[in-house]
């Protein structure tokens, strides 16, 4: 298949970085990282007609070019620009779902509500979801032993900079009503230090985005509090309002029922508050 051709053509040999080299605090590059990225790219472009003209070999070249031979604490958004360009994707800008600390439910939702998109439903998000990667300065090796941890080592590491870059672009592309799913079980329902709070919120374009609608997902079955009144939600409302974007908030008291009603909106029990 296309994937075999790609590997045959270049006979990639990815050597592990020797154990005596720099040890970082975070886990190393995901096993079979190049193969995984290429396989995901091929699969995604086969499934999504608007991306079928994308050349996965070029995508991989751009991906590895962003971090190979570079110090893993000195990665910039510019390093990822070629990858961002090749992964440019026109998703319906009024169908964007952002999320913070509740990825699984957000993904379950877009798997059912097929016309809405999280970042991980786009090519670039899909390629990198749940993967770790880093290289080493002045060598073409991938470090499978350890990679920098955002807190303990450095923030400008390959994975963090990738997600910051791709999240910014995703938010910039949004329009009309943008939805965000927030985890009501956490002490900070809205966290200014999350990717949503530090990147996406500040890159929504007021000339294109009319409203940000937050869906606060409740954790306990008996939790009937109005979490839209939470101080951190009020903080989010304040940040959004100052950017001339309207804000609205909804409690999702029963996430299981919420998903069920997305699947079967005709169900008689779906008219009440979820």
């Amino acid at each position: 298949s296309g994937l075999n051709d790609i590997f045959e053509a270049q006979k990639i040999e990815w050597h592990e970085v020797p154990r005596w080299r720099q040890q970082w605090s975070g886990p190393g590059t995901t096993k079979r990282f190049p193969e995984t990225v290429l396989a995901r790219c091929v699969k995604y472009t086969e499934i999504h007609p608007e991306m079928r003209h994308v050349d996965c070999q070029s995508v991989w070249d751009a991906f590895k070019g962003a971090f190979i031979s570079k110090h893993p604490c000195n990665i910039t958004e510019e390093d990822y620009q070629p990858l961002m360009k090749l992964g440019t994707q026109t998703v319906p800008c009024n169908k964007i779902l952002l999320w913070s600390r509740i990825k699984d439910l957000a993904h379950q939702f877009t798997q059912v509500q097929r016309d809405m998109f999280t970042l991980e439903d786009t090519l670039l998000g899909y390629l990198a979801d749940d993967l770790t990667w880093c290289g080493e300065f002045n060598t073409s090796k991938i470090n499978y032993q350890s990679c920098p941890d955002w807190r303990k080592d450095c923030s400008n590491n390959p994975v963090s900079v990738f997600w910051k870059t791709v999240s910014r672009r995703f938010a910039e592309a949004a329009c009309d009503v943008v939805h965000v799913m927030l985890n009501g079980s956490r002490s900070k329902i809205f966290d200014k230090n999350s990717t949503f709070g530090s990147v996406e919120v500040h890159n929504l374009q007021p000339e294109k985005v009319q409203t940000l609608e937050a869906w606060v997902i409740h954790g306990g079955r008996e939790d009937s509090r109005d979490l839209c009144q939470d101080p951190t939600i009020k903080e989010l409302e304040s940040i959004i309002s100052k950017r001339n974007i309207q804000f609205s908030c909804k409690n999702i008291y029963r996430p299981d029922k919420f998903l069920q009603c997305v699947k079967n909106p005709e169900d008689s029990s779906c008219t009440s508050e979820i």
Partner: antibody, heavy 123, light 110 residues
Framework: EVQLLESGGGLVQPGGSLRLSCAAS????????IIWIRQAPGKGLEWVAA?????????YYADWAKGRFTVSKDNSKNTVYLQMNSLRAEDTAVYYC???????????????WGQGTLVTVSS | DIQLTQSPSTLSASVGDRVTITCRSS????????LAWYQQKPGKAPKLLMY???NLASGVPSRFSGSGSGTEFTLTISSVQPDDFATYYC??????????FGGGTKVEIK
């Protein structure tokens, strides 16, 4: 002053090959995508291929150009090339190179163009 | 294939007239607004006028303006000047970093 200068155009027979050059001056090649765009006589514009070389070449092509056209770059000469093979009459056009600034606010449009070089495919 | 359709294909105007050119894309452009406009004079390369639908390129007179989003865009010249008689092209930016150009609109002297 930013300058892009195309050369290498001329008359070629159907099935023949030609290599176009785009020499850049007045800016650092490494921060820009260089895009080849063509314009058939009296017709509109059509993009052909793109290349960017911050560290290793990253290139991609319009669907119709894949296989017949190859873009490459010589950083030491600040020159981009377009190798065109199996040429057909419908490839007759003025071929322009243009630059696109590499940065998310700037990508997707071309702020500097060369003067173009004419390629005529005819027997 | 993505189609960008410009209308009209030819437009006759007098100096001082207000002129509007429309560009329709068969697919939404990236980010809803990633569309550029170029001006081309005979024997010359195109020149960037507008980018991201409504942003004026450096050195372009303020009589040029752009609007629109998604699939429908317009370029307006509020008061046509002698230097503005030329052909105008729209250009969209799409998935995978691909580009498409409109067929052009020739603005000629009435």
């Amino acid at each position: 002053e930013v300058q892009l200068l195309e050369s290498g155009g001329g008359l070629v027979q159907p099935g023949g090959s030609l290599r176009l050059s785009c020499a850049a001056s007045g800016f650092s090649f490494n921060n820009y995508w260089i895009i080849w765009i063509r314009q058939a006589p009296g017709k509109g514009l059509e993009w052909v291929a793109a290349i960017y070389s911050p560290s290793g070449d990253i290139k991609y092509y319009a669907d119709w150009a894949k296989g017949r056209f190859t873009v490459s770059k010589d950083n030491s000469k600040n020159t981009v090339y377009l190798q065109m093979n199996s040429l057909r009459a419908e490839d007759t056009a003025v071929y322009y190179c243009a630059r696109e600034l590499a940065g998310s606010s700037y990508e997707g449009y071309f702020e500097s163009w060369g003067q173009g070089t004419l390629v005529t495919v005819s027997s | 294939d993505i189609q960008l359709t410009q209308s009209p294909s030819t437009l006759s105007a007098s100096v001082g007239d207000r002129v509007t050119i429309t560009c329709r894309s068969s697919q939404s452009v990236y980010g809803h607004n990633w569309l550029a406009w170029y001006q081309q004079k005979p024997g010359k390369a195109p020149k960037l006028l507008m980018y991201r639908a409504s942003n004026l390129a450096s050195g372009v007179p303020s009589r040029f303006s752009g609007s629109g989003s998604g699939t429908e865009f317009t370029l307006t010249i509020s008061s046509v000047q002698p230097d503005d008689f030329a052909t105008y092209y729209c250009q969209g930016y799409y998935s995978g970093g691909s580009y498409a150009f409109g067929g052009g609109t020739k603005v000629e002297i009435k």
